[in-house]
């Protein structure tokens, strides 16, 4: 069954945590649907964003952070492992120095930590997708 | 009650027709939600777009057409009559030479016809909004 979009969930992250998302674009790639995943510092959507991950399907991926209300330097990738009309599985793993983003089991993007992952309190998944799975797994201490 | 988004409806347009849309952005303007309205030449989403109207709330509006599968010259406006967090009413009227877009009763944007409005067969409303009303009114002959 489908999860509501935008989908918001409280989360605590640290090295070893993984966020897993399963979904499908709502439009053909010609129409450039978006997927966005934001790791927020508060439960409020206006809060700072530790890791912003935005896919313009079929075109590009941009990653960034929003600190003290201001967007910082954007990182762009033309790598496009997503398939038009197909379901995707996205997993974002917290490594000691960066986030590693896997798409359908394939390492596709990385983003160096700018703010400690422990600052994350909420994850939001939104834009032009249907969402079937959202999970945060925590490393067993 | 809410209409599904993306929302797609068959439509025939000509001079005097008006498309009316009521909705609300799904996120605060800081997060740059989008609204998109596309007038298509076929019932298929990959078809050409006679009039493409995309709002990046709080930032800008772009208008364009997609002809023989290719985007043409974009028209951009910084005019932003939409209010953060507020419901909007959008009406797109077909004039003899252009589309006139009204936001909350105020004339806000125009776009000269590149393709005859009679080529429109479908209207799609989508991206980051909740939709409460969609109506196409036809001029009484």
């Amino acid at each position: 069954s489908l999860l509501p979009v935008p989908y918001t969930e409280a989360a605590s992250l640290s090295t070893g945590s993984t966020v897993t998302i399963k979904g499908r674009p709502l439009a053909c790639f010609l129409n450039e649907p978006y997927l966005q995943v934001d790791f927020h510092t508060e439960m409020k959507e206006e809060s700072d964003i530790v890791f912003h991950f935005q896919v313009c399907f079929g075109r590009r991926v941009v990653m960034n952070s929003r600190e003290y209300g201001a967007w910082k330097q954007q990182v762009e990738s033309k790598n496009m492992p997503f398939q038009d009309g197909q379901e995707f599985e996205l997993s974002i793993s917290v490594l000691p120095d960066k986030y590693q983003v896997m798409v359908n089991g394939q390492s596709s993007y990385t983003f160096d930590h700018r703010i400690k992952p422990e600052a994350v309190k909420m994850v939001q998944v939104w834009r032009d997708i249907s969402l079937t799975k959202f999970n945060v797994s925590y490393l067993k201490r | 009650s809410l209409l599904p988004v993306p929302y797609t409806e068959a439509a025939s347009l000509s001079t005097g027709s008006t498309v009316t849309i009521k909705g609300r952005p799904l996120a605060c303007f800081l997060n740059e939600p989008y609204l998109q309205v596309d007038f298509h030449t076929e019932m298929k989403e990959e078809s050409d777009i006679v009039f493409h109207f995309q709002v990046c709330f709080g930032r800008r509006v772009v208008m364009n057409s997609r002809e023989y599968g290719a985007w043409k010259q974009q028209v951009e406006s910084k005019n932003m009559p939409f209010q953060d967090g507020q419901e909007f009413e959008l009406s797109i009227s077909v004039l003899p030479d252009k589309y006139q877009v009204m936001v909350n009763g105020q004339s806000s944007y125009t776009f000269d016809h590149r393709i005859k409005p009679e080529a429109v067969k479908m209207v799609q409303v989508w991206r980051d909004i909740s939709l409460t009303k969609f109506n196409v009114s036809y001029l009484k002959r």
Epitope: - | Y68, D97, I115, K116
Partner: antibody, heavy 116, light 112 residues
Framework: QVQLVESGGGLVQPGGSLRLSCAAS????????MSWVRQAPGKGPEWVSD????????YYADSVKGRFTISRDNAKNSLLLQMNSLKPEDTAVYYC?????????WGQGTQVTVSS | QTVVTQEPSLSVSPGGTVTLTCGLS?????????PAWYQQTPGQAPRALIY???SRHSGVPDRFSGSISGNKAALTITGAQAEDEADYYC????????????FGGGTHLTVL
């Protein structure tokens, strides 16, 4: 990119027949109306015939009505013009073309010469 | 029968500006006629330049511009170049049905 390539022209005697073809690529052929336009030597272009995207509606210039038949095969991305009872005044370069309220894209043309 | 009128010939100096017009034998050209302009050089197929009054096709230099002026459609070439010497045709859209796109007789432009 959009490409239209005509073929099937040639020299034919008055009263004879020819079948012109236009192979389309680079766009979703079945979504678009198509036209044949001809240009006689030293003259301007002249509309000959139209067919709508599904093939259900066809239109002809008075000068060719009853002699020419336009058709299309959307599965093969192909536009056809069957020309019967040809006359010397049908001598022209024949172009296939497409557009919404004009002719955005043209083929390179195929020469038809009707002469004894 | 609809007749679309154009100047048979015009000339322009290199670097100069010239305006070609496209009219109707009876009545005015309006936006609903979606005037379009084409360029043809000897031995070549016509090439679409402008459609829907003033929209340029991709790859068309911006020295070509379209408008409606008075009761006619117009094509203006600003900063004419030697390669602009050609025949120019306009079409007007006359509504749905048979022969809905009508050609003008053409203008031969000489760049002196």
């Amino acid at each position: 990119q959009v490409q239209l390539v005509e073929s099937g022209g040639g020299l034919v005697q008055p009263g004879g027949s020819l079948r012109l073809s236009c192979a389309a690529s680079g766009f979703t052929f079945g979504n678009y109306d198509m036209s044949w336009v001809r240009q006689a030597p030293g003259k301007g272009p002249e509309w000959v015939s139209d067919i709508n995207s599904g093939g259900g509606s066809t239109y002809y210039a008075d000068s060719v009505k009853g002699r020419f038949t336009i058709s299309r095969d959307n599965a093969k991305n192909s536009l056809l013009l069957q020309m019967n009872s040809l006359k010397p005044e049908d001598t022209a370069v024949y172009y296939c073309a497409t557009g919404y309220t004009g002719y955005y894209y043209w083929g390179q043309g195929t020469q038809v010469t009707v002469s004894s | 029968q609809t007749v679309v009128t154009q100047e048979p010939s015009l000339s322009v100096s290199p670097g100069g500006t010239v305006t070609l017009t496209c009219g109707l034998s009876s009545g005015s050209v309006t936006s609903s006629n979606y005037p379009a302009w084409y360029q043809q050089t000897p031995g070549q197929a016509p090439r679409a330049l402008i459609y829907s009054i003033n929209s340029r096709h991709s790859g068309v230099p911006d020295r070509f511009s379209g408008s409606i002026s008075g009761n006619k459609a117009a094509l203006t070439i600003t900063g004419a170049q030697a390669e602009d010497e050609a025949d120019y045709y306009c079409t007007l859209y006359m509504g749905t049905g048979s022969n809905n796109v009508v050609f003008g007789g053409g203008t031969h432009l000489t760049v002196l």
